[in-house]
């Protein structure tokens, strides 16, 4: 008869054998035989295995080293690696969070359409007309151009999208 | 509730072909494996076939490898087996066929887990004559 | 393939009786052995997986041991709704292999 060549979901096939994998959280330290079981061992401190596996050495921890700008955002455990996020004032340059960046500023011009997060950057957006921003900020949006009318007053000097209008007294009429 | 049903069975020839379905409902069809067992009338039960929770892997008895085929669409909760193939039915394939869920029991306090057939469908009637 | 051969292939006995079914495996199976109860024109239902530990729901007059090649199914003390034919089933590895049955018969 020949040998198996395939095995069940939570098992693998070694030396003819359909033997169990070891648990997430734990490494393989020796394959079953006929009359023996797949002997596992739980993974050390700092170190993890995330799926049911065959691994002889079990994963380290990330670390997350605050001279890039890391900090933990939830800590390891046996079964799941460390989760690391930015400082505040930063954000992670990748998906896998491996070095941080300042958050970058709208300039002059520009308003802040969304707010950087530790995983996100800023993200700027010009300002439309009737709208400005005079300082280079990772926060503030555009501002609205000061309406003259409702408070009597006159447009002197039409707003950019850097500048607020210069609102003045209406002209008085000589008599 | 967690149900298998079973479909398909009917009379054929022999060397003819037969699709047979078995419907799941109650549970999350796709995370499981799933198996084909037979019994001839009056006779104990046969492993008939395997198939893994996403349909990559299969496996068969050796009385039907080549003849019958396995597989699965987990959009519809639906197991299927092709009967048809070389030397397709036979006088011997005549038995009721149940599809059965392969779970998986494990106790994380425990070492290793254990596989057994935990829900079965009732099963459907196949006849091979002439 | 993995022989299974169980033993005795039929039985009688009373109500209250202690029962013994055994299951040998050709090779080595270690503890991946389940045991079936199937009554006529009914799916067989799962009593026991991983050799010895009981599926939720059955009684616990039934239980199961045994490790490697040799197997035993044990009903400590039988009821009328137990007579039915019993099966044991390997899932170490494919082709997945059933024992022959053993029917128990009310005396």
């Known amino acids: 008869p020949e040998p198996p060549t395939a095995c069940r979901e939570k098992q693998y096939l070694i030396n003819s054998q359909c033997c169990s994998l070891c648990q997430p959280g734990q490494k393989l330290v020796s394959d079953c035989t006929e009359f023996t079981e797949t002997e596992c061992l739980p993974c050390g401190e700092s170190e993890f295995l995330d799926t049911w596996n065959r691994e002889t050495h079990c994963h380290q921890h990330k670390y997350c080293d605050p001279n890039l700008g890391l900090r933990v955002q939830q800590k390891g455990t046996s079964e799941t690696d460390t989760i690391c996020t930015c400082e505040e004032g930063w954000h992670c340059t990748s998906e896998a969070c491996e070095s941080c960046v300042l958050h970058r500023s709208c300039s002059p011009g520009f308003g802040v359409k969304q707010i950087a997060t530790g995983v996100s950057d800023t993200i700027c957006e010009p300002c439309p007309v009737g709208f400005f921003s005079n300082v280079s900020s990772a926060f503030e949006k555009c501002h609205p151009w000061t309406s003259c009318e409702t408070k009597d007053l006159v447009v002197q000097q039409a707003g950019t999208n850097k500048t607020d209008v210069v609102c003045g007294p209406q002209d008085r009429l000589r008599a | 509730e967690v149900q298998l049903l079973e479909s398909g069975g009917g009379l054929v020839r022999p060397g003819g072909s037969l699709r047979l379905s078995c419907a799941a409902s109650g549970f999350t069809f796709g995370s499981y494996e799933m198996n084909w067992v037979r019994q001839a009338p009056g006779k104990g039960l046969e492993w008939v076939s395997y198939?893994?929770?996403?349909?990559?892997?299969?496996?068969?008895?050796d009385s039907v490898k080549g003849r019958f085929t396995v597989s699965r669409d987990n959009s519809k909760n639906l197991l299927y087996l092709q009967l048809e193939g070389m030397n397709s039915l036979r006088a011997e394939d005549t038995a009721v066929y149940y599809c059965?869920?392969?779970?998986?029991?494990?106790?994380?306090?425990?070492?290793?887990?254990?596989?057994?057939?935990?829900?079965w469908g009732q099963g459907t009637m196949v006849t091979v004559s002439s | 393939d993995i022989q299974l051969t169980q033993s005795p292939s039929s039985l009688t006995a009373s109500v209250g009786d202690r029962v013994t079914i055994t299951c040998r495996s050709s090779?080595?199976?270690?503890?991946?052995l389940a045991w079936y109860q199937q009554k006529p024109g009914k799916p067989p239902k799962l009593l026991i997986y991983?050799?010895?530990s009981l599926e939720g729901g059955v009684p616990s007059r039934f239980s199961g041991s045994g490790s490697g090649t040799d197997f035993t199914l044990t009903i400590s003390s039988l009821q009328p709704e137990d007579f039915a034919t019993y099966y044991c089933q390997q899932l170490n590895s494919f082709p997945s292999t059933f024992g022959q049955g053993t029917k128990l018969e009310i005396k």
């Open positions: 991983g050799a010895s």
């Open positions: 090779q080595g199976i270690r503890s991946s």
């Open positions: 198939i893994s929770s996403s349909g990559e892997t299969t496996d068969y008895a």
């Open positions: 059965a869920r392969d779970v998986f029991f494990f106790d994380s306090s425990g070492d290793n887990g254990a596989y057994g057939m935990d829900v």
